[in-house]
Amino acid sequence: IFPLAFFIYVPMNEQIVIGRLDEDIILPSSFERGSEVVIHWKYQDSYKVHSYYKGSDHLESQDPRYANRTSLFYNEIQNGNASLFFRRVSLLDEGIYTCYVGTAIQVITNKVVLKVGVFLTPVMKYEKRNTNSFLICSVLSVYPRPIITWKMDNTPISENNMEETGSLDSFSINSPLNITGSNSSYECTIENSLLKQTWTGRWTMKDGLHKMQSEHVSLSCQPVNDYFSPNQDFKVTWSRMKSGTFSVLAYYLSSSQNTIINESRFSWNKELINQSDFSMNLMDLNLSDSGEYLCNISSDEYTLLTIHTVHVEPSQETASHN
């Protein structure tokens, strides 16, 4: 309902708003203040999203999908603010919203294009499948389809069999890379160009270490300083691979500065941790300690994996007893 009077028609302008799944957003709309304000928000020019006139909301004909999800900035309407507060956006909310505002002297039309993105924190995993070693970059829920970049020693490479499953809401993506026998460094970047958000996984293989039984081993884990910042929340996990699966030896949470140690022979140097050095010592080695040791430093923005191979050999004494 617009007042029947002489009014100026102001041509439409268009804005893009980018929202994140399940978060609240504001669809902006402003007008030159005036009396007898009427505001109608519509979706794709047909579904009624929100209506306001005669000083209050009139939501009788509001489309059910918007029930309890929209409101105006009521104290600011008289100042020319017709913006819509929109709760818990979903991917189904994407599209064009039109705001029609009428006052005693003019009618204005504002178009807002809503785009919705999803980006759940990805992960980088190291897996053994029979005799093959794989790095897998995966993201459980992402929208729109992300750009995935693999690099070997800082040069882009092709990964050949990305697994992608699409649902109504988003994509789930697994990108495996066979790294069997390689000692190169690898990097995987997953980029959501709509949300302007990226995540990077890095994998570095250290030279193999040969140790004698009952000696101790020192395994380094120092993040390179381009991505890593000690001011951000992160988690460090040391694990050992046994018969194809990793068991956690210890972990550290930066938020609480807590260290949890599951293996009594494992030690971490608190002073080194304070200097962002997560190298560890394993004392009194025995033959069953041979294997792969993985240091995983993870935050919302990256995963840094460092892998060491340790070979424990029988000491001379043990060998002569046999």
Partner: antibody, heavy 119, light 111 residues
Framework: QVQLQQSGAELAKPGASVKMSCKAS????????IHWIKQRPGQGLEWIGY????????EYNQKFKDKATFTADKSSSTAYMQLSSLTSEDSAVFYC????????????WGQGTTLTVSS | DIVLTQSPASLAVSLGLRATISCRSS??????????MHWYQQKPGQPPKLLIM???NLESGVPARFSGSGSGTDFTLNIHPVDEEDTATYYC?????????FGGGTKLEIK
């Protein structure tokens, strides 16, 4: 909205140094990288390098390694580029530009700082 | 360094028709999944503006009349139908390996 506001035009003598600034607003400064790009009058664009404000890590185009130095001040969301041992070849417009972490294209640019090197 | 060669150096296209700008790199800058080529538009007295990233992905807010394609060493920017406001210089840029370089630019004039 995202904005990169660069410092004003500079006039410098050969051999001198200048330091220009790029103040970011409308986004989380430490979540993106700042790249610097050179454009000589009537010519194309040259990538100088970038700084990661969160960690102060820098990467330079070899050509500019001894010419440019990047710094960043997180508290004021400002990135800086210092150019040393100036010659007439350094006369150009210098842009700062925002880049996503790990992605080497530039989605927002400053308006540019014009540097004139003249005796 | 990777050299990007743009052609033509300049072109004039009638309003409403198609403009095609080519960018050729001195070595391949794509994998089987991604082309590491990006396109920018620069108007006089203004900074460049991102149009397309990774060969074919339109930046949010850029009109759909802009499109990109290509792989390996050959990439193309298409503008159809051209509008008066598309008068500008267009640059390609690769992000394959350091240092990242730009093409020499193509100046587009609308007739």
């Amino acid at each position: 909205q995202v904005q990169l506001q660069q410092s004003g035009a500079e006039l410098a003598k050969p051999g001198a140094s200048v330091k220009m600034s790029c103040k970011a607003s409308g986004y989380t400064f430490t979540s993106f990288w700042i790249h610097w790009i050179k454009q000589r009058p009537g010519q194309g664009l040259e990538w100088i390098g970038y700084i990661i404000p969160n960690t102060d890590y820098t990467e330079y185009n070899q050509k500019f390694k001894d010419k440019a130095t990047f710094t960043a001040d997180k508290s004021s969301s400002t990135a800086y580029m210092q150019l040393s041992s100036l010659t007439s070849e350094d006369s150009a417009v210098f842009y700062c530009a925002r880049g996503l972490r790990g992605a080497y294209y530039f989605d927002y640019w400053g308006q540019g700082t014009t540097l004139t090197v003249s005796s | 360094d990777i050299v990007l060669t743009q052609s033509p150096a300049s072109l004039a296209v009638s309003l409403g028709l198609r403009a095609t700008i080519s960018c050729r790199s001195s070595q391949s800058v794509s994998t089987s999944t991604n082309g590491y080529m990006h396109w920018y538009q620069q108007k006089p007295g203004q900074p460049p503006k991102l149009l397309i990233m990774y060969a074919s992905n339109l930046e949010s807010g850029v009109p759909a009349r802009f499109s990109g394609s290509g792989s390996g060493t050959d990439f193309t920017l298409n503008i159809h139908p051209v509008d008066e406001e598309d008068t500008a210089t267009y640059y390609c840029q690769h992000s394959w390996v350091l240092p990242y370089t730009f093409g020499g630019g193509t100046k587009l004039e609308i007739k």
